[in-house]
């Protein structure tokens, strides 16, 4: 049909911080490159209907659906979504094409569905259909990378079976310990799947996609390093590949390396060797032990021996299922207001855990550090001396673990008082929970030393209310004390605080706060 206009449908994705995205459905200023959505004529449909390619959007993403119409004369339009008509304001671009835009800000489930655009031009009427859905991130996965030997080459391939396809990078470091932290200048990153330089001190492979980043370290025994006090331990699940690198440096090439499992030499095809000269003409040899898919019988002590170095071993444990081993009993701590203190959890886990610390329904990042004995530790110090319940939560593919901590801050009671016609009440939020005394101030006792015991009702909190321990004491008014000043005092191991109350008539009372340490 020659009367049909040339139509182009595009999708523009906005970065979340893009201030150019307006709230109306008129066109926003955009700099992102538009994605062509095709817009083909829909066959066998009554009337002229164009259908754009389906649009998948991440939750909270902002997008613009845009139609470019190459037709002479003016156009008028109407958007319809879920039986509601929406405002439509066409404009013309520099090429004199009609431009109609629909902005969707911060995509939600309710904004998913069919968007119909009805356009009326001088020549003809037609409809354009957009189908917008939320991308199902439930299908997304991010799997820990693993290693494979490259066919016919002395190189390692890093593989992560993840959706969407991850970016794979090698993270290399030639220093020891702390200086191999991610941000260190000693760290070199290579965004490629294959690694040929396998002689470095510390080799890790990382994979990242929308779900985050996962890394796997190449397990290494260095025969030139003093062995750890406890035997290094490597956990693997049945079916996973095993890779252990044995590395040794010697003044010349006159030495060899071998692998044994429980005193039996590894079969050929389960190891390969590489060697190179370093800058100072010493020889570096590495010998890889590998099993493409481990079974339970691959468990045992793997020993790397050298003709010129003391041998070293690692215990490889093959498990059916991942685990997190730690004590989950809740722990209560009492600290002073300015005391330095950190919560800590010591655990052994495989695969590596993801963890969070939570306080007052806020989550905090969780750092974990490996200890020499095969355990890891996570500490949380950012409590800012706020009392309450702190939760450590860890999980991996196969296990979950939660541990509760309670933090109480020792402090002197603060006393607040209130009186009515029939009673006077004092409240305190000190910790440990305070004890109470009431004293009467009179001519006989100007220093308020005459203790009141009648009509006093003390109560310590039997639970926290809104995270706060509250203790209270109430004095029921009797004729004997009406018109007198009385003093309520709360005391605990950190000190005493008092308030003086004039018992006369209901209404606002003059309170005098005494702070006695």
């Amino acid at each position: 049909n020659q009367d049909l206009p040339v139509i182009k449908c595009v999708l523009i994705n906005h970065k979340n911080n893009d201030s150019s995205v307006g709230k109306s459905s008129s066109y926003p200023m955009v700099s992102e490159s538009p994605e062509d959505l095709g817009c083909a004529l829909r066959p066998q449909s009554s009337g002229t209907v164009y259908e754009a390619a389906a649009v998948e959007v991440d939750v909270s993403a902002s997008i613009t659906l845009q139609v470019l119409v190459d037709a002479p004369g003016n156009i008028s339009c109407l958007w319809v979504f879920k039986h509601s008509s929406l405002n439509c304001q066409p404009h013309f671009d520099l090429q004199n094409r009609g431009v109609v835009s629909m902005v969707i800000l911060k995509m939600t489930e309710t904004q998913a569905g069919e968007y119909l655009l009805f356009i009326q031009s001088e020549a003809t009427n037609y409809t354009i259909l957009f189908t917008v859905s939320i991308r199902n991130t439930l299908l997304y996965t991010l799997r820990r990378p693993y290693f494979r030997k490259m066919e016919n080459q002395d190189a390692l391939v890093c593989i992560s079976e993840s959706v969407p396809e991850p970016i794979v990078e090698w993270v290399l470091c030639d220093s020891q310990g702390e200086s191999c932290k991610e941000e260190s200048p000693a760290v070199v990153k290579k965004e490629e799947k294959v690694l040929h330089e396998l002689f470095g001190t510390d080799i890790r492979c990382c994979a990242r996609n929308e779900l985050g980043r996962e890394c796997t370290r190449l397990f290494t025994i260095d025969l030139n390093q003093t062995p750890q006090t406890t035997l290094p331990q490597l956990f693997l699940k049945v079916g996973e590949p095993l890779w252990i690198r044995c590395k040794a440096v010697h003044v010349n090439h006159g030495f060899g390396l071998t692998w044994e499992l429980e005193n039996k030499a590894l079969e050929e095809g389960n190891y390969f060797e590489m060697s190179t000269y370093s800058t100072n003409r010493t020889m570096i040899r590495i010998l890889f032990a590998f099993v493409s898919s481990v079974a339970r019988n691959d468990t045992g002590y793997y020993t790397c021996s050298s003709s010129k170095h003391p041998s070293q071993s690692a215990l490889v444990t093959i498990v059916e299922k991942g685990f997190i081993n730690a004590t989950n009993s809740s722990e209560d701590y009492e600290i002073d207001q300015y005391e330095e203190f950190c919560f800590s959890v010591r655990f052994k886990a495989y695969p590596q855990i993801r963890c969070t610390w939570t306080f007052s329904r806020k989550s905090f990042p969780c750092e974990q550090k490996g200890l020499d004995n095969g355990y890891s530790i996570s500490k949380f110090c950012n409590h800012k001396h706020q009392p309450g319940e702190y939760i450590f939560h860890a999980e991996n593919d196969d296990a979950q673990f939660t541990k509760m901590f309670t933090l109480n801050i020792r402090r002197k009671p603060q006393v607040l008082a209130e009186a009515s016609a029939s009673q006077a009440s004092c409240f305190s939020d000190g910790y440990p929970l305070p004890s109470w005394t009431w004293k009467k101030c009179s001519d006989k006792s100007p220093n308020c030393t005459e203790e009141i015991t009648e009509g006093v009702w003390n109560r310590k909190a039997n639970r926290k209310v809104f995270g706060q321990w509250v203790s209270s004491s109430t004095l029921n008014m009797s004729e004997a004390i009406k018109g007198f000043l009385v003093k309520c005092c709360a005391y605990n191991s950190l000190g005493t605080s008092c308030e003086t109350i004039l018992l006369n008539s209901p209404g606002p009372f003059p309170f005098i706060q005494d702070n006695i340490s």
Epitope: L416, E418, R463, F466, G467, S472
Partner: antibody, heavy 123, light 108 residues
């Protein structure tokens, strides 16, 4: 026995804020913790947060964090709940309720409720 | 947060019959800090039971509560005409305090 009297019904536009008051009489206001609970038409009860007036300590349900502010004025024995960035799904009856924290008052359960304030959010 | 699930959703009974309402928690309710409320149309809720089994002031003894941990029950031994209403359980042992979705007790 403490009585709680709430402010009157409100009609609000989406995006605006509402502030509901709850005045206590017939008891010692500071001896209580005040909670705010809402009930959408035909729905169940939902705890929004609360305050211990004598200590001024407020606590909020995660769902409302950042949108709700609960305050109390001990001199007038009044608690307030302000909800901002209103949307149509905030249309509900808002109740204040109290539980005792001192004296011979129990520490448990809301033994006194306000009459409720209907907040309608509509454009 | 602790999720409370009440069952059944609706209970159809005649006056004089016994009503048993259940409230199950997604995790243990500390110190049995669980309350039961009654609500009639157009009215604010009314406290019946606190601490899982203690009757509030002025509540008739036909109302009783029991249970601990994750399973709690409200029993009305003989239904009176004024007992037909919606009943809610609420835990106040850990914040956020949460309510069950309610059980409607209606006349059969």
């Amino acid at each position: 026995q403490v009585q709680l009297v709430q402010s009157g019904a409100e009609v609000k536009k989406p995006g605006s804020s509402v502030k509901v008051s709850c005045k206590a009489s017939g008891g010692t206001f500071s001896s209580y913790a005040v909670s705010w609970v809402r009930q959408a038409p035909g729905q169940g009860l939902e705890w929004m947060g609360g305050i211990i007036p004598i200590f001024g300590i407020a606590n909020y349900a995660q769902k409302f964090q950042g949108r709700v502010t609960i305050t109390a004025d001990t001199s007038t024995s009044t608690a307030y709940m302000e909800l901002s960035s209103l949307r149509s799904e905030d249309t509900a009856v808002y109740y204040c309720a109290i539980e005792g924290i001192g004296g011979d008052l129990r520490y448990e359960g809301y033994d006194a409720w306000g009459q409720g304030t209907l907040v309608t959010v509509s454009s | 947060e602790i999720v409370l699930t009440q069952s059944p959703g609706t209970l159809s009974l005649s006056p004089g019959e016994r009503a048993t309402l259940s409230c199950r928690a997604s995790q243990s309710v500390s110190h049995s800090y669980l309350a039961w409320y009654q609500q009639k149309p157009g009215q604010a809720p009314r406290l019946l039971i606190y601490g899982a089994s203690f009757r509030a002031a002025g509540i008739p003894d036909r109302f009783s509560g029991s249970g601990s941990g994750t399973d709690f029950t409200l029993t009305i031994s003989r239904l009176e005409p004024e007992d037909f209403a919606v009943y809610y359980c609420q835990q106040y042992g850990s914040e956020p305090y949460t309510f069950g979705q309610g059980t409607k007790v209606e006349i059969k």
